[in-house]
């Protein structure tokens, strides 16, 4: 009889075991285990009748189509075999064990005791057949195995071979190299590769196979396994395989498809091809006069581009438009996209106008082309070029006038300062105790008129100032402080300020320049209680033209000591000139006591200690600070007075040979102007040089040489 066994392990014993088995008995055990397992059989006890070639009693182990072993007896002899320690392994998942005893047994034989178990098959080690083994990596597990692929490969649907995804390769460059995947290593199996060469219309693709060409083939059938096909429009070239590469192919098309197919077997190294675009040839090019073309080639084909440029100092001219370079291109029909342009000499055109300056041409015919030269100069004697610049500009290759120091920036004509058009007389007679000034003697002198219409009734007063540049007036802060009913420092509105320059006689303003204010700047620390920091600036709405009657005064060097004691200075103004009029009378009578003609006086600087002492001896707050100095005579008689406020106290600087503003008329008192031992007090300008330059928006270093020349 037959016993079916499906367990993963078990025990098989001869009938009656451990007693002797009966005669004339036959039992078959069919053992089946799952796929991926084999069966291992071994015997713990074996005692059968011995016979030649096991003819009588035996145990036969077999598979469906193969006898694995036949055992009998007790000991192995030449003609009979006992299992002993031997293990029987089935090749597959099925094993059949048959026990047979004949009709007679001369002795009692105890039979056998066998055990079986399912054991895992290591398919990775045992698969020799290429058709069944993994292409790249094999992974065994109990009851089975699986395959995997190297990086960049994909497992085929057969779960065994490794293919690549190579159906999406687009080539758009004019030249390139295409290879089979992994070249020169063997190409992957089960793959369909598609390579597209897509160039611009007008190009034609030429193919050339190189180096190794090795695609699996067949001796009789053309390329049944692996192959290359080349598709050009509707036409298909190939298939190609074997070890002989195809001849170079001229496709006559700008669009080419290369198909490469591999089946699931074989180890071939693949292929490599280079492609290049061919196009129509364009005519030879001649560079323009004073120019060149790049790149310079013997031949130019479709899509080649050349850049036309000109020598230094020349510009490309195309259709009356100037440019630095011009590009032309070889077209698909073999013509150039444009004619070669010409090279035209750079023209800097008419140079920019220089404010307060002139231009002279150094080159004949007033040429403005490349390397031409011009010279800027300032309107002397009223303006001088900043930093003593040469003023020489050359027409550069870029088409701009260039100066070695300033580059493309124009020079600056700064107003000359401290040089009156007529010399001040050395002898000044004994403003109070002064004398009439000749026109042009104090060209920096400004009359500042303030008409405060925000007050009821309208307030009107005047003061003096000093021209520092074409746009700025220096004066005392108290002149430009709103004459309020309290001691708050608030500047007057710029709308209420008018400045007169070049004025000699206040009755005749026709020859004077009058200007409104763009800004009124009081020193931020101006103190109304003691007139400390009594300094201010007015920026004019428009720069004033300089001339013999309108010229700036120079600012001093930054020196805290201020003017040296006993130095003589000049001060001018339209203030009270009559020593018999009292200050109270002036205050009550408004502007009627103004002097018609500009007056001036020569006064010595008073030692600081002497001045301080003279004021400290008075009752009231008469402090003379380090930001002030005094000038005048002990005996009186000559002084500045009300209405001269803000005017410049100028001293001649021997070093620079210029007049420098050292002081601004600030205050005095309490006695009448010109009284004995009542010195005029002036703002010490040298303490404020930095502040002045800062407000005017010029760094001091730029203009310092004004008083150093």
């Amino acid at each position: 009889h037959t016993v079916e066994l499906n367990n993963m392990f078990g025990q098989i014993q001869s009938p009656g075991y451990p007693d002797s088995y009966p005669s004339d008995s036959e039992v078959t055990w069919n053992i089946t285990v799952p796929d991926g397992f084999r069966i291992k059989l071994y015997f713990m006890h074996f005692n059968l009748e011995s016979s030649y070639l096991c003819e009588y009693d035996y145990v036969k182990v077999e598979t469906e189509d193969q006898v694995l072993a036949t055992f009998c007896g007790r000991e192995t002899t030449d003609t009979e075999q006992t299992p002993g320690q031997e293990v029987v392994l089935s090749p597959g998942s099925f094993m059949s064990i048959t026990f047979r005893s004949d009709f007679s047994n001369e002795e009692r034989f105890t039979g056998f005791d066998a055990h079986y178990m399912a054991v895992d098959v290591d398919e990775c080690k045992e698969r020799e057949d290429e058709e069944l083994s993994c292409d790249h990596y094999c992974h065994n597990y109990i009851g089975g195995y699986y395959c995997s692929c190297r990086f960049g490969y994909i497992l085929h649907t057969d779960n065994r071979t490794c293919r690549v995804e190579c159906s999406d390769n687009l080539f758009t460059q004019r030249t390139g190299v295409i290879t089979s995947p992994d070249f020169p290593n063997p190409y992957p199996k089960s793959s369909e590769c598609l390579y597209t060469i897509e160039l611009e219309e007008g190009f034609m693709v030429n193919l050339q196979f190189e180096d190794i060409f090795d695609i699996e083939d067949h001796p009789e059938v053309p390329c049944p396994y692996d192959y290359i096909k080349i598709k050009v429009g509707p036409k298909v070239l190939g298939p190609f395989c074997g070890e002989k590469a195809p001849e170079p192919i001229s496709t006559q098309s700008h669009s080419v498809l290369i198909l490469f197919h591999s089946d699931n077997s074989g180890e071939n190294r693949g292929w490599r091809l280079s492609y290049r675009a061919a196009g129509n040839e364009c005519p030879e090019l001649q560079p323009p006069v004073h120019g060149k073309i790049e790149p310079s080639q013997a031949k130019y084909f479709f899509k080649d581009q050349v850049l036309v440029s000109c020598d230094t100092g020349y510009k490309v001219l195309k259709d009356n438009v100037e440019m630095d370079t011009f590009q032309i291109e070889c077209l698909k029909d073999g013509t150039w996209s444009n004619k070669i342009p010409t090279c035209k000499i750079v023209d800097c055109r008419a140079p920019g106008e220089l404010e307060h300056g002139l231009i002279t041409f150094s080159t004949r015919n007033n040429l403005t082309t490349y390397k031409s030269e011009i010279k800027y100069s300032c309107q002397e004697p009223y303006y001088k070029m900043l930093n003593n610049n040469t003023g020489i500009y050359t027409c550069s290759a870029q088409g701009v006038w260039m100066n070695k120091v300033l580059g493309r920036s124009l020079p600056t004509c700064l107003p000359e300062c401290g040089q009156p058009s007529r010399s001040l007389p050395s002898l000044v007679k004994r403003i109070i105790g002064g004398r009439n000034a000749e026109p042009g003697l104090f060209p920096w002198q400004a009359l500042i008129v303030v008409e405060d219409t925000s007050r009821v009734p309208n307030d009107k007063w005047f003061g003096s100032g000093a021209l520092l540049s074409a746009s700025w007036i220096l004066t005392a802060a108290h002149v430009l402080r709103s004459q309020r009913r309290d001691t708050t420092v608030i500047p007057v509105s710029k709308e209420h300020v008018t400045v007169y320059l070049g004025l000699h006689d206040v009755r005749d303003k026709s020859g004077a320049v009058n200007s409104s204010a763009a800004r009124v700047v009081l020193h931020p620390d101006f103190n109304i209680q003691n007139y400390n920091h009594d300094i201010a600036l007015v920026q004019l709405q428009e720069p004033v033209p300089l001339g013999p009657h309108v010229m700036p005064v120079c600012l001093p060097r930054l020196e805290p000591e201020g003017p040296a004691p006993h130095m003589l200075g000049l001060v001018a103004g339209w203030g009270i000139s009559n020593p018999n009029v009292t200050v109270d009378e002036i205050i009550s009578s408004g502007t009627r006591t103004l002097s018609d003609v500009l007056q001036y006086v020569k006064l010595p600087v008073v030692p600081h200690a002497e001045c301080k002492t003279s004021y400290e001896s008075r009752s009231g707050n008469y402090s003379v600070t380090e930001n002030m100095f005094c000038a005048g005579y002990y005996e009186g008689g000559k002084d500045t007075c009300l209405g001269d406020s803000g005017g410049a106290f100028v001293i001649f600087d021997d070093l620079s040979q210029r007049w420098v503003v050292q002081g601004l008329v600030s205050w005095g008192g309490p006695e009448e102007c010109g009284s004995k031992q009542v010195y005029g007090v002036y703002t010490k300008v040298s303490n404020y040089v930095d502040w002045v330059w800062e407000q005017m928006g010029l760094p001091q270093s730029v203009v310092e040489p004004q008083v150093e020349r």
């Epitope: 001691t487 608030i490 509105s493």
Partner: antibody
Framework: QVQLVQSGAEVKKPGASVKVSCKAS????????INWVRQAPGQGLEWIGW????????KYNDKFKDRATLTVDTSSNTAYMELSSLRSEDTAVYYC???????WGQGTLVTVSS | DIVMTQSPDSLAVSLGERATINCKSS????????????LAWYQQKPGQPPKLLIY???TRESGVPDRFSGSGSGTDFTLTISSLQAEDVAVYYC????????FGQGTKVEIK
């Protein structure tokens, strides 16, 4: 013509704050200062502070400098006086004046009562 | 701080008579540079804001009748109403503007 129009009367609890407005017209607001003065019922005038709209400069009476805040909005030509931590003795009419006291607002009565 | 003291606290004057109010400051209000005394006089009628009469101690505000005059310098100042009118009944204040602002306590002027 020049006019200063103040906001209406306010009743506040002790500890609260009050903000009085003063809208100017008829002159250039930024060219002059605004003063604030108060007058308690039956009492004299007491200066609070001063503001200059052109640059937001302020000056305060020491008595009020920790509690009063003066501000301006030049876009609407309006000045403001805010008084914080109110107490009953802050009950007063609050005036604004401009152009150096030539023009005055009509006054705003602020009553501080619990 | 500058302290301002007015005298008398109240004053009764017959119509057409002169009325004089004094004001004393704790320090000089004369600025030696501008040569001005920073003192002003105000008139306040019931329910109205103050009205500026005099500034710089003696300058009359525009539109103020010339019966009002101011005098004094330094620390002592006077407001004079040369001929009292019925409409002059009010409280008068002096104010210093030399250093910030301080008002006097006020002087009440009535008709006798």
């Amino acid at each position: 013509q020049v006019q200063l129009v103040q906001s209406g009367a306010e009743v506040k609890k002790p500890g609260a704050s009050v903000k009085v407005s003063c809208k100017a017209s008829g002159y250039t607001f930024t060219t002059d200062d605004i003063n604030w003065v108060r007058q308690a019922p039956g009492q004299g005038l007491e200066w609070i502070g001063w503001i200059y709209p052109r640059d937001d400069r302020t000056k305060y009476n020491d008595k009020f400098k920790d509690r009063a805040t003066l501000t301006v909005d030049t876009s609407s030509n309006t000045a403001y006086m805010e008084l914080s931590s109110l107490r009953s003795e802050d009950t007063a009419v609050y005036y604004c004046s401009s152009l150096e006291d030539t023009y005055w607002g009509q006054g705003t009565l602020v009553t501080v009562s619990s | 701080d500058i302290v301002m003291t007015q005298s008398p606290d109240s004053l009764a004057v017959s119509l057409g008579e002169r009325a004089t109010i004094n004001c004393k400051s704790s320090q000089s209000l004369l600025n030696t540079r501008t040569r001005k005394n920073y003192l002003a006089w105000y008139q306040q009628k019931p329910g109205q804001p103050p009205k500026l009469l005099i500034y710089w101690a003696s300058t009359r505000e525009s539109g103020v009748p010339d019966r009002f005059s101011g005098s004094g310098s330094g620390t002592d100042f006077t407001l004079t109403i040369s001929s009292l009118q019925a409409e002059d009944v009010a409280v008068y204040y002096c104010k210093q503007s030399y250093n910030l602002y301080t008002f006097g306590q006020g002087t009440k002027v009535e008709i006798k």
